[in-house]
């Protein structure tokens, strides 16, 4: 994401079209309080960040309110008055949707429909991953609304499920982030379980975008 300028690496995350987080990693300035200056219009004066992120007592990022904005963020990271990194980016291409909420499971024989609250914006994929203790990998199914039906399940097996939201790559590009996963829930014979006992620890999910 961030080309290096004077050894500065940046990362931008636009959380749920609400808050933009810009973080930096500047080895040359590791013991320095760099300042973050920004604007949303190319001809405005820069404002200084009022909500810094700190790492080991020094500034390492900035959080900005930017609700529902498809704007270019113009920003400058400075050491005193000296800019060490200046750039501008369309924020929306760094979207990270929020984690699915109100996840529900509706069972019918060998199939389950997983639903959750759709986010207020579109061009998203809702992905359900699931596995039984007998599966070596997580299986995955996704739809463009949070209404995902998985068929061909074995009613006698215990299944673990979790859900996340991803931005469609052909719309938002390759630099977005999937949401955090919802909590894992376990089901057997259409009933919720504390855990699928046969697996002491579930394997890591596929991290495919």
């Amino acid at each position: 994401q961030g080309g290096a300028a004077e050894g500065v690496q940046i990362q931008i995350i636009y959380f749920n079209l609400e808050t933009v987080q810009v973080t930096w990693n500047a080895s040359k300035y590791s013991r320095t309080n760099l300042t973050f200056h920004y604007r949303f219009n190319g001809d405005e004066a820069y404002d200084q960040c009022t909500n810094y992120l700190l790492q080991e007592g020094h500034t390492s990022g900035c959080l900005l309110d930017a609700e529902q904005r498809d704007d270019i963020l113009y920003f400058s990271i400075r050491n005193g008055t000296h800019p060490v990194f200046t750039a501008s980016r369309w924020m929306v291409y760094y979207l990270k949707p929020s984690s699915p909420k109100h996840v529900r499971f509706s069972w019918h024989q060998d199939a389950v429909t997983v639903t959750c609250s759709d986010l207020s914006y579109g061009d998203l994929l809702y992905e359900v991953q699931y596995r039984s203790p007998f599966d070596t990998e997580w299986q995955s199914k996704q739809e463009n609304t949070c209404n995902v039906t998985i068929e061909g399940l074995d009613a006698e097996k215990c299944y673990s499920f979790w859900v996340r939201v991803k931005a469609m790559e052909d719309v938002y590009g390759p630099d977005t982030y999937p949401s955090d996963w919802s909590e894992v829930t376990c089901w057997q014979r259409g009933e919720i379980r504390d855990a699928c006992a046969e697996t002491p620890t579930p394997p890591k999910p596929k991290l495919s975008k």
Partner: antibody, heavy 125, light 106 residues
Framework: QVQLVQSGAEVKKPGASVKVSCKAS????????ISWLRQAPGQGLEWMGW????????RYAQGFTGRFVFSLDTSVSTAYLQISSLKAEDTAVYYC??????????????????WGQGTLVTVSS | EIVMTQSPATLSLSPGERATLSCRAS??????LAWYQQKPGQPPKLLIH???TRVSGVPDRFSGSGSGTDFTLTISSLQAEDVAVYYC????????FGQGTKLEIK
């Protein structure tokens, strides 16, 4: 289908003003931003900025502040570009254009799928 | 600003030949690159976005490649209707265009 229809060619004297219109149809006007671009004769394309059709908020690219004003009349799904104190170097074809992909927020985001036919503005004494 | 440089300025090829158009960005634009085709008296037409993704309805003889600073538009078998000026455009930040490559038929 989506259409952007621009007003006709204009010939103006230096120092005058011009207002170019861009009427949108075939979609909900307030769900996509409108960008303005210009192309001087025999030259490449320059992005002038964009206007949020939901809020009316304009964003001007560097070099296009002061004499250039973006405005809207949402009741007739029309965006406007006004240029004041015209100079000979403003002679160009002016295009309105619309993002074609992101429906998430009312933005521009830089990829122009739908274009007006262009309006030639000639500034000559 | 990010400066986009296209080469060659003019490309003259015979029908059926392969056309390779290059575009270089003055700094990394990741994959935020589009290609447009412009015919005389018409507005530009978007062909490719995200450097490699063909827009719906664009013939599959058009393909894009590259990321970072170096990009290529390839027309696998040139046809008479492909005569036009081709522009690359970055949209990592506020959009900037290359100066164009004029594609001619010999």
């Amino acid at each position: 289908q989506v259409q952007l229809v621009q007003s006709g060619a204009e010939v103006k004297k230096p120092g005058a003003s011009v207002k170019v219109s861009c009427k949108a149809s075939g979609y909900t006007f307030t769900t996509y931003g409108i960008s303005w671009l210009r192309q001087a004769p025999g030259q490449g394309l320059e992005w002038m900025g964009w206007v949020n059709t939901n809020t009316g908020n304009p964003r001007y690219a560097q070099g296009f502040t002061g004499r250039f004003v973006f405005s809207l009349d949402t009741s007739v799904s029309t965006a406007y570009l006004q240029i004041s104190s015209l100079k000979a170097e403003d002679t160009a074809v002016y295009y309105c254009a619309r993002e074609g992909f992101i429906t998430t927020v009312v933005g521009a985001a830089g990829r122009f799928v739908y274009w007006g036919q262009g309006t030639l503005v000639t500034v000559s004494s | 600003e990010i400066v986009m440089t296209q080469s060659p300025a003019t490309l003259s090829l015979s029908p059926g030949e392969r056309a390779t158009l290059s575009c270089r960005a003055s700094q990394s634009v990741s994959s935020s690159l589009a290609w447009y085709q412009q015919k005389p008296g018409q507005p530009p037409k978007l062909l490719i976005h995200w450097a490699v993704t063909r827009v719906s309805g664009v013939p599959d003889r058009f393909s894009g490649s590259g990321s970072g600073t170096d990009f290529t538009l390839t027309i696998s078998s040139l046809q008479a209707e492909d005569v036009a000026v081709y522009y690359c455009q970055q949209y990592s930040t506020y959009p900037t265009f290359g100066q164009g490559t004029k594609l001619e038929i010999k």
